[in-house]
Interface confidence: medium
């Protein structure tokens, strides 16, 4: 993939990969980064209670509604 692909996808994204199977109770803080010029996708960074920071999949069922509320200001998205 050439530089055009980088412009389309990576740009300056925070998350290179996401971690699966994280229990919500392990999360102490959640940061949601909207799509923007810096990155072409929504990114979710979770601070865990053990001090680690990981990236989560915004499509994960337990996150979807939370992210919709954050991104859409209470508007219900499809």
């Amino acid at each position: 993939a050439g530089p055009a692909a980088a412009v389309l996808r990576e740009l300056r994204c925070v998350c290179l990969q996401t971690t699966q199977g994280v229990h919500p109770k392990m999360i102490s803080n959640l940061q949601v980064f909207a799509i923007g010029p810096q990155c072409s996708k929504v990114e979710v960074v979770a601070s865990l209670k053990n001090g680690k920071e990981i990236c989560l999949d915004p499509e994960a069922p337990f996150l979807k509604k939370v992210i919709q509320k954050i991104l859409d200001g209470g508007n219900k998205e499809n």
Epitope: A1, S40, V42, D72
Partner: antibody, heavy 119, light 107 residues
């Protein structure tokens, strides 16, 4: 729910220009990309370009540079596509669509705007 | 530009039949592939994204698979409402490009 309402059909003369609008509702306009797609009978679907209104950021297909200009009015949550120097080749249905959580797919589509270029 | 070769261009199938449509990219698109259904005089409807994920509200009879250059859309049991034209879209590299479409009709 998410809705993209496009402007109505246009009959325009060759050599003139036209502006198509796409009014978004049901979500925060500045948090997603708006893409524009052209469809001509027998030619399938063709990506024109996309726009991130939160930062006035646009990408265009090489085929549409100098033909299409994408803009947005965030106060009314409306995206616009302006087409210039129209010829019969520009006669088509034009769709706007909204990205999903990733710019790389189109989650919601407008109903389409038919542009007919004829003298 | 990446070329998307979609096949077949048209097909007919019976109710309840399993239907598969394929798309081949001219290079690796890393699963940045989505599928859209379009009925005459209507706008496209999103079915599948990231090659395998089902869009909201899409019946579970639709599924997507594939990786690298080769992808497919499967309808496990065809229903009358599924008669339409289906398009694949790669968005792995700019510009995004669509397949030419597969027109699916009932036998």
């Amino acid at each position: 729910q998410v809705q993209l309402q496009q402007s109505g059909a246009e009959l325009v003369r060759p050599g003139t220009s036209v502006t198509i609008s796409c009014k978004a509702s049901g979500y925060t306009f500045t948090n997603y990309w708006i893409v524009w797609v052209k469809q001509r009978p027998g030619h399938g679907l063709e990506w024109i370009g996309d726009l991130y209104s939160g930062g006035g950021y646009t990408f265009y297909s090489e085929n549409f540079k100098g033909k299409a200009t994408l803009t947005a009015d965030t106060s009314s949550s409306t995206a616009y596509m302006h087409l210039i120097s129209l010829t019969s080749e520009d006669s088509a249905v034009y769709f706007c669509a909204r990205s999903g959580y990733d710019r790389t797919w189109f989650a919601h589509w407008g109903q389409g705007s038919l542009v007919t270029v004829s003298s | 530009d990446i070329k998307m070769t979609q096949s077949p261009s048209s097909m007919s199938a019976s109710l309840g039949e399993r239907v598969t449509i394929t798309c081949q990219a001219s290079q690796d698109i890393e699963s940045y592939l989505s599928w859209y259904q379009q009925k005459p005089w209507k706008s496209p409807k999103t079915l599948i994204y990231y090659a395998t994920r089902l869009a909201d509200g899409v019946p579970s009879r639709f599924s997507g698979s594939g990786s690298g250059q080769d992808y497919s859309l499967t309808i496990s049991s065809l229903e009358s409402d599924d008669t339409a034209t289906y398009y694949c879209l790669q968005h792995g590299e700019s510009p995004p490009t669509f397949g030419a479409g597969t027109k699916l009709e009932l036998k």
